[in-house]
């Protein structure tokens, strides 16, 4: 008769953790003739240090069920046993759930910390930016996002086995040009005949696509680059200037900056 009451027995203390070495034995009650070999399902090229013993090194989180058979002239299969391997959370990632499109300054924003599986299921969440803890919920919410909130975010999920971090996720905030100012080179007082360069400095995302320059009469000047070069500069160029920057989000304007052009010694001498 074939081997009777064949069972697959896990020798390890529970729980089994990912990375453990697991030993299983194939036991039976009686057999006639004697058991001469054992089979295991599934195949994993595992170690068989002795007859009826299977050793799984570095057990994976995904090992579910294993069954053995004891064989004489016939094989009797045991019911499969679940290894029930415990492991740290897997495939942790940051996902933006709100808004669905790109993020503009002032938007309400929600980030979700997702993971594919965890055993045990009880988990904790941690959010961080630049090494600073921001929250301990599965979601990170911003009621009104600001450009200063842009940066690299990570979430961590941990259980009793270990913790797993997401890849860093870059939060990009789009905003209209701001903090505009007109800077003047070589300075805000220039002698006639020399050159003066006015630069429209700004902070914008996406970058400013074009600039508009205005004089003290709010007349737009026929220049659309970031730098306005006056060469040679004339006394009539004296006055206040301001610039406007435009990107796909909107426009921003600078305060007035005054350029003073003074007469050269030659001009004064002629007078």
């Amino acid at each position: 008769y074939p081997p009777k009451k064949v069972t697959t027995v896990i020798q390890n203390p529970m729980p089994i953790r990912e990375g453990d070495t697991v030993t299983l034995s194939c036991n039976y009650n009686s057999s006639n003739p004697s058991v001469t070999r054992y089979e295991w399902k599934p195949h994993g090229a595992w170690e068989e240090p002795s007859l009826g013993v299977l050793k799984i090194q570095n057990v994976g989180w995904d090992n579910t069920t294993i069954a053995c058979a004891a064989c004489n002239s016939w094989c009797s299969w045991a019911s499969p046993v679940a290894l029930n391997v415990q492991y740290a959370p897997r495939d942790v990632r940051v996902r933006k759930i709100k808004p669905l499109s790109e993020i503009h300054s002032g938007n309400s924003v929600s980030l979700q910390c997702d993971f594919s599986s965890s055993h045990p299921k009880e988990v904790q969440f941690f959010w961080e930016k630049n090494g600073r803890l921001l929250g301990k919920e599965s979601q990170l919410n911003f009621d009104s996002i600001s450009p200063e909130d842009a940066g690299s975010y990570s979430c961590w999920v941990n259980n009793s086995i270990g913790q797993t971090a997401s890849k860093a996720w870059t939060l990009e905030v789009l905003y209209a040009p701001r903090r505009l100012r007109v800077s003047m080179s070589p300075g805000d007082q220039v002698m006639e005949g020399k050159s003066a360069t006015l630069t429209c400095e700004s902070d914008a995302n996406p970058p400013v696509s074009h600039y508009t320059w205005f004089d003290w009469n709010n007349q737009s000047l026929p220049y659309h680059s970031q730098k306005l070069r006056l060469e040679p500069v004339k006394v009539q160029h004296s006055g206040a200037y301001w610039c406007q920057g435009t990107n796909s989000v909107g426009k921003g304007r600078s305060p007035l900056s005054t350029l003073t052009v003074y007469y050269s010694p030659e001009t004064i001498g002629r007078r």
Partner: antibody
Framework: QVQLVESGGGLVQPGGSLRLSCAAS????????MSWVRQAPGKGLEWVSS????????YYADSVKGRFTISRDTSKNTLYLQMNSLRAEDTAVYYC???????????WGQGTLVTVSS | DIQLTQSPSSLSTSVGDRVTITCQAS??????LNWYQQKPGKAPNLLIY???NLQTGVPSRFSGRGSGTDFTLTISSLQPEDIATYYC?????????FGQGTRLEIK
Amino acid sequence: QVQLVESGGGLVQPGGSLRLSCAASGFTFSNYAMSWVRQAPGKGLEWVSSISGSGGSTYYADSVKGRFTISRDTSKNTLYLQMNSLRAEDTAVYYCARYGSAAWMDSWGQGTLVTVSS
Amino acid sequence: DIQLTQSPSSLSTSVGDRVTITCQASHDIRNYLNWYQQKPGKAPNLLIYAASNLQTGVPSRFSGRGSGTDFTLTISSLQPEDIATYYCQQYDGLPLTFGQGTRLEIK
């Protein structure tokens, strides 16, 4: 990252021998079972042989049993396939692959071509 | 030996299509089945193991189902980079065997 690099392929006459090597890096070699899988030109995949992490258990396809020997050297992080009494039907690209927890091959080398011809 | 029969053996399809490949085992193999993708001139790449588990790094448009003798690999929305040959493989017992392959091509 896991890297497997095969070498040792080439042209050999029927009845001849060849030894393939697979250099492994990026993981703890002794923790993983390994295997050889081959692919004849224009054909599908065929499992050839496997070996346990310690090298204590080896397994072969019937078509190569008695002619091929799989082995590993943990000190060199290298897997081998000694092929003797080669036949024309052994012509194929030979891949070495790492086992996952069970017999799924989660990392593969780029392959080395073995041509058996007179 | 356990035979695996894939169908169809080749499939002409369009970008964005939902594609399903089937693999039938000659015996009950529980969920001991894997799926691989192989692009021309390249080594195979593991997509799905143990019938339904997505390998790390594989896009979520790939999914696997089935147990016993009938298994499927589904690509929810075919992308140009998915053009390849797909193989199933069983590990219920030795010898490990592969299906004959399913070649995907663009219409």
